[in-house]
Interface confidence: low
């Protein structure tokens, strides 16, 4: 009984820019080849349980097969590598989830308001939908101090946990990061006293 996977798909956590091409490889372990009396030409690739056309598949050597997708558009695809063994019985070798989306846009229109004696709320426009898990972090500093980062829950605003110091200019910007890239907004510089919201 083979308890370990019969092989692996690389990359193991594929994230692809939507509209681009993508190639994955499946590498069979030597023990698997011998156990099932197969080689890489016996590999069947599947996406969401449907067989991938043979013209997208290349047998590289006896252990390795590759599959290429052009113009990837689906946000999430289950990609599996399978082998046809004894009398066409299909055995799953390995599976990965292929995600597609966009790198984050540069956040724009960053603005902040101060709730006197409490906290500061900053908001921004994140740009187009990325279709991927994207983290937005509000960063701030001034000449002699780095303030704590603020992790945005919604991707469009963040309430900072510190009370900003008045009468000194602070610098604030937003960083956006996902598996396809990292970018920041332009920084804004202001004295928090000028951003106090009238009560």
């Amino acid at each position: 009984q083979l308890l370990e996977p019969c092989g692996y798909i690389y990359p193991e956590f594929p994230v692809v820019q939507r509209g681009s091409n993508f190639t994955a490889i499946c590498v069979l372990k030597e023990a698997c080849l011998q156990h099932y009396y197969v080689n890489a030409s016996y590999i069947v690739w599947k996406t969401n349980h449907a067989a991938v056309p043979r013209e997208q598949v290349t047998v590289i050597n006896r252990t390795t097969s590759s599959v290429t997708f052009t113009d990837v558009v689906l946000p999430s695809v289950q990609l599996t590598c399978n082998i046809l063994s004894f009398g066409q019985i299909e055995q799953n070798v390995y599976g990965v989830t292929m995600l597609s989306g966009f790198p984050p846009d540069k956040p724009t229109n960053l603005t902040c308001i101060v709730n006197e004696g409490k906290n500061m709320l900053c908001q921004w426009d994140p740009g187009r939908e990325t279709y991927l898990e994207t983290n937005y972090t509000l960063k701030s500093e001034w000449a002699t101090e780095k303030f704590p980062d603020c992790q945005s829950k919604h991707g469009t605003s963040c309430m900072v946990s510190y009370m900003p110091t008045y009468y000194v200019n602070i610098e604030v910007w937003v960083e956006a990061e996902n598996a396809l890239g990292k970018v920041s907004s332009e920084s804004i510089n202001f004295d928090p006293v000028d951003k106090v919201k009238p009560t």
């Epitope: 610098e171 990292k182 920041s184 332009e186 920084s187």
Partner: nanobody, 124 residues
Framework: QVQLQESGGGLVQPGGSLRLSCAAS?????TYWMYWVRQAPGKGPEW???????????YYADSVKGRFTISRDNAKNTVYLQMNSLKPEDTAVYYC?????????????????TGQGTQVTVSS
């Protein structure tokens, strides 16, 4: 005239150290994020490191993380790159650049560097 002048490069043995400097003139360094970008012979430019305006937020390419340290002295209008544990693959011309914001540029998007740069050669 806006200018960035790199210096401090040289020939060093593997495992050695160098400190690069970039002096800005014609503009106030503290209003810009600063970057180091390198270009090896026959290769495209590679983003190495970035430092925020105040100097508290620093970023590094995976290939140099833990070995290089970027810093800045806004009073002296200078940005530095301390390079330790140098490897032959660090051999390149190093350029400093400025920007109004931070970009973790992917490999195919690094802007082509301009200026002289400073040559770093790591060889035994």
């Amino acid at each position: 005239q806006v200018q960035l002048q790199e210096s401090g490069g040289g020939l060093v043995q593997p495992g050695g150290s160098l400190r690069l400097s970039c002096a800005a003139s014609g503009f106030t360094l503290s209003t810009y994020w600063m970057y180091w970008v390198r270009q090896a012979p026959g290769k495209g430019p590679e983003w190495v490191s970035a430092v925020s305006r105040g100097g508290f937020n620093t970023y590094y390419a995976d290939s140099v993380k833990g070995r290089f340290t970027i810093s800045r002295d806004n009073a002296k209008n200078t940005v530095y790159l301390q390079m330790n544990s140098l490897k032959p693959e660090d051999t390149a011309v190093y350029y400093c650049m400025s920007s109004v914001s931070f970009y973790g540029w992917p490999p195919d998007r690094v802007p082509s560097p301009t200026g002289q740069g400073t040559q770093v050669t790591v060889s035994s």
